[in-house]
């Protein structure tokens, strides 16, 4: 679809005569008829296959034609066509004299024709005007013409329909050749496909508008290139969605079980030594002068029993003071003014002279200590039991009472709940975080496979010849009650004729 445009520029008829040579009265009031048709080697009369157009009276005798496209749109003349432009044409331009106001062909005398020109040739679609001038013996016509495509039609033949759009069906403008030119941010044959945010992962991301990056399930991040780990995954990562691969020092399905509490939390205070003792568990070994689970509390100065030889300790603002018993002196009552003659050793301790009798030393029996064997040994003061074990003094020794799940002299070993073979009747034991689980063999059930569940031995119909089957519950075997005429453990032999022998 397009328009053949004809711009009339100047008509010269100096003598003001008709084609017959007769002069116009009072002058030639001139209008034009245009016929556009298919290419003919010799332009002949006949239907104007591409269209016709007439002008009003444009002037008298000789005149220039104003460009009137802005006004009524009469010049250039428009000859629209609704087909593919063939690239060739024939054009007939007739100049007529209008004696009156009626310009219809049937209202004009046949000799009102002033001049007629006919041209034919090739014409490509384009914006450029072709200037032409046709001269006869009495007249001259200067004009220009071109073919342009109608709105939304493009290409060499105006055959390519292209209407710019920016909606769900496409986002484009049209190139001169009719091809689509996508608006920024759109791509695809019809510019329907948004161009996602630069770097948006091809598989894991998508977009519904340009510069967007929406993530498919299981993916996250600005570019949808980070997998989403398993819901609840605490200290783990993923390489594909919904995984939970634990970071070092963490365990469990959700990587929430702290296998290295000491490193992750540094719970021990005041220079104490931290030891991991199982999942989310630890033990702090305090430096002297500190106490508490995390060694977070100082001991009162007297709590370390600094006074020797039965001296009594008194806390003071700036430390402590030892009140020494008779016969002793020094900061910690460590110096003695006694000798073995004074029987200074208590609780059956034996006295040994030292420094030529100026001093002595007590050798204490088991369970007693101190310079004078005055202190009963408390073997639990060093808190030797690990994992929350309770320390008990037992005469000359000590023992640890362990919490469930721990064993060893100092409760330092983690007990496998399955170690004591708790599953009966050949059940398989599985250690769990909070206990154990037994998988029972056929015929047994219960938490420890301790319950015998009866197996129906008759289920396989082992008895023949309509015998009745009974299950022996004590042995899980069957017994067949034979009908008359049959014997055997399965009632498989008929009774009657004795077996025949071959001899």
């Amino acid at each position: 679809s397009g328009v053949f445009q004809l711009q009339l520029q100047e008509f010269i008829n100096e003598r003001g005569v008709l084609a017959s040579g007769r002069p116009c009265e009072p002058g030639c009031r001139t209008f034009f008829r245009v016929c556009l048709k298919h290419f003919q080697a010799v332009v002949s009369p006949g239907p104007c296959t591409f269209g016709t157009v007439s002008t009003p009276v444009l002037g008298t005798n000789s005149f220039a034609v104003r460009d009137d496209s802005s006004g009524g749109g009469r010049n250039p003349l428009q000859l629209p066509f609704n087909f593919t432009w063939p690239g060739t044409f024939s054009l007939i331009i007739e100049a007529w004299h209008a004696p009156g106001d009626d310009l219809r062909p049937e209202a004009l005398p046949p000799d009102a024709l002033i001049s007629k020109i006919a041209i034919q040739g090739s014409l490509a679609v384009g914006q450029n005007w072709l200037l032409d001038e046709q001269t006869s013996t009495l007249t001259r016509l200067r004009y220009s013409y071109r073919v342009i495509c109608s709105d939304n039609y493009y290409g060499d033949n105006c055959s390519r329909l292209c209407k710019k759009r920016n909606d769900h069906f496409g986002h484009y403008v049209c190139q001169p050749d009719g091809n689509l030119s996508c608006l920024p941010g759109w791509t695809g044959e019809y510019c329907q496909q948004p161009i996602c945010l630069s770097g948006c992962h091809e598989q894991n991301g998508y977009c519904s508008k340009p510069a967007e990056c929406l993530c498919r399930p299981g993916w996250q991040g600005r570019l949808c290139n980070e997998c989403i780990p398993h819901n609840g995954c605490r200290h783990g990562t993923c390489s594909t969605p919904w995984q939970c691969t634990c970071d070092e020092g963490w365990g469990g399905l959700f990587c929430d079980q702290d296998l290295n509490y000491c490193t992750h939390h540094s719970p021990c205070k005041n220079g104490a030594t931290c030891s991991n003792s199982g999942q989310r568990s630890y033990t702090c070994t305090c430096r002297p002068g500190y106490t508490g689970v995390d060694c977070e509390l100082e001991l009162s100065e007297c709590d370390s029993n600094p006074c020797r030889n039965g001296g009594s300790c008194k806390d003071q603002e700036d430390g402590y003071h030892c009140l020494c018993p008779p016969g002793y002196y020094g900061l910690h009552c460590e110096h003695s003014t006694l000798s073995c003659a004074d029987s200074p050793c208590f609780n059956g301790g034996s006295c040994r002279e030292r420094n030529q009798g100026a001093n002595y030393a007590c050798e204490c029996p088991p369970n007693f200590t101190g310079s004078n064997c005055e202190k009963k040994v408390d073997r639990c003061t060093s808190n030797p039991c690990a994992n929350g074990g309770q320390c008990l003094n037992r005469g000359p020794s000590r023992m640890c009472r362990c919490r469930p799940g721990f064993t060893g002299t100092y409760c330092e070993l983690h007990v496998s709940d399955c170690a004591r073979n708790p599953c009966a009747h050949g059940g398989t034991c599985h250690d769990l975080e909070n206990g154990l689980m037994c998988t029972c063999p056929a015929g047994f059930s219960g938490r420890r496979c301790e319950v015998r569940t009866s197996i129906d031995a008759c289920a396989s119909s082992p008895c023949f010849n309509r015998a009745t089957c009974y299950t022996d519950l004590s042995t899980d075997t069957f017994v067949c009650n034979c009908p008359y005429g049959f014997v055997g453990s399965r009632c498989e032999f008929p009774v009657g004729l004795p077996p025949s022998f071959p001899w």
């Epitope: 939390h265 719970p267 689970v293 509390l297 100082e298 001991l299 009162s300 806390d315 700036d318 929350g388």
Partner: antibody
Framework: QVQLQESGPGLVKPSQTLSLTCTVS??????????WTWIRQHPGRGLEWIGY???????HYNPSLKSRVTMSVDTSKNQFSLKMTSVTDADTAVYYC???????????WGRGTMVTVSS | DVVMTQSPGTLFLSPGERATLSCRAS???????LAWYQQKPGQAPRLLIY???SRATGIPDRFSGSGSGTDFTLNISRLEPEDFALYYC?????????FGQGTRLEIK
């Protein structure tokens, strides 16, 4: 916000064992570096620290009560407990559970439960 | 044990006045591990100050604490009617943790 609630019998016979439980709500007993503590207040008198337990089950007690006191923790129920053996009328008091976050200043307290030791 | 001694035993003041409560430790309390609590009849104690001078969450700025070593003070700049209660100091530097015997603040 975080709340603590003590529960247990209000009357215990002499020489028997006092058992109390503290239920923690709006906070996991396993989270943070909290010391879950028991404190008591004798009628008309001051406050006495009994001891604390951590979620790991490790506890630290007042040396004056150590021989009679045991604390335990049940993370699945979000509770911690106090057991005191061989009680006498000197153990009659209001017993409070409290939270100490990171150090031993007690920012959250239970309402307290009165325990009377009497035959 | 670290003995905490509070003075005075009872303090009589009027609303709008300034209150100064003292607490002395029998041994040095390191790192200012000292707290102050307020207790009203039938209620549990409420933490006011920790670390000798840091106000607990939600405590009005009229309450302030100071001191180090063995001598500590709780100041209430302008007494409100609801401030008349029992106040305890507590050390948490040494084991066992110990409280003062309390100072009762009463309306004059």
């Amino acid at each position: 916000q975080v709340q603590l609630q003590e529960s247990g019998p209000g009357l215990v016979k002499p020489s028997q064992t006092l058992s109390l439980t503290c239920t923690v709500s709006s906070d996991s007993i396993s989270s943070g570096n909290n010391y879950w503590t028991w404190i008591r207040q004798h009628p008309g008198r001051g406050l006495e620290w009994i001891g604390y337990i951590k979620y790991t089950g490790s506890a630290h007690y007042n040396p004056s009560l150590k021989s009679r006191v045991t604390m335990s923790v049940d993370t699945s129920k979000n509770q911690f407990s106090l057991k005191m053996t061989s009680v006498t009328d000197a153990d009659t008091a209001v017993y409070y559970c409290a939270r100490a976050p990171g150090s031993h200043s007690f920012d959250i307290w239970g309402r307290g439960t009165m325990v009377t030791v009497s035959s | 044990d670290v003995v905490m001694t509070q003075s005075p035993g009872t303090l009589f003041l009027s609303p709008g006045e300034r209150a100064t409560l003292s607490c002395r430790a029998s041994q040095s309390v390191s790192s200012s591990y000292l707290a102050w609590y307020q207790q009203k009849p039938g209620q549990a104690p409420r933490l006011l100050i920790y670390g000798a001078s840091s106000r607990a969450t939600g405590i009005p700025d009229r309450f302030s604490g100071s001191g180090s070593g063995t001598d500590f003070t709780l100041n209430i700049s302008r007494l409100e009617p609801e401030d008349f209660a029992l106040y305890y100091c507590q050390q948490y530097s040494r084991s066992p943790i110990t409280f003062g015997q309390g100072t009762r603040l009463e309306i004059k």
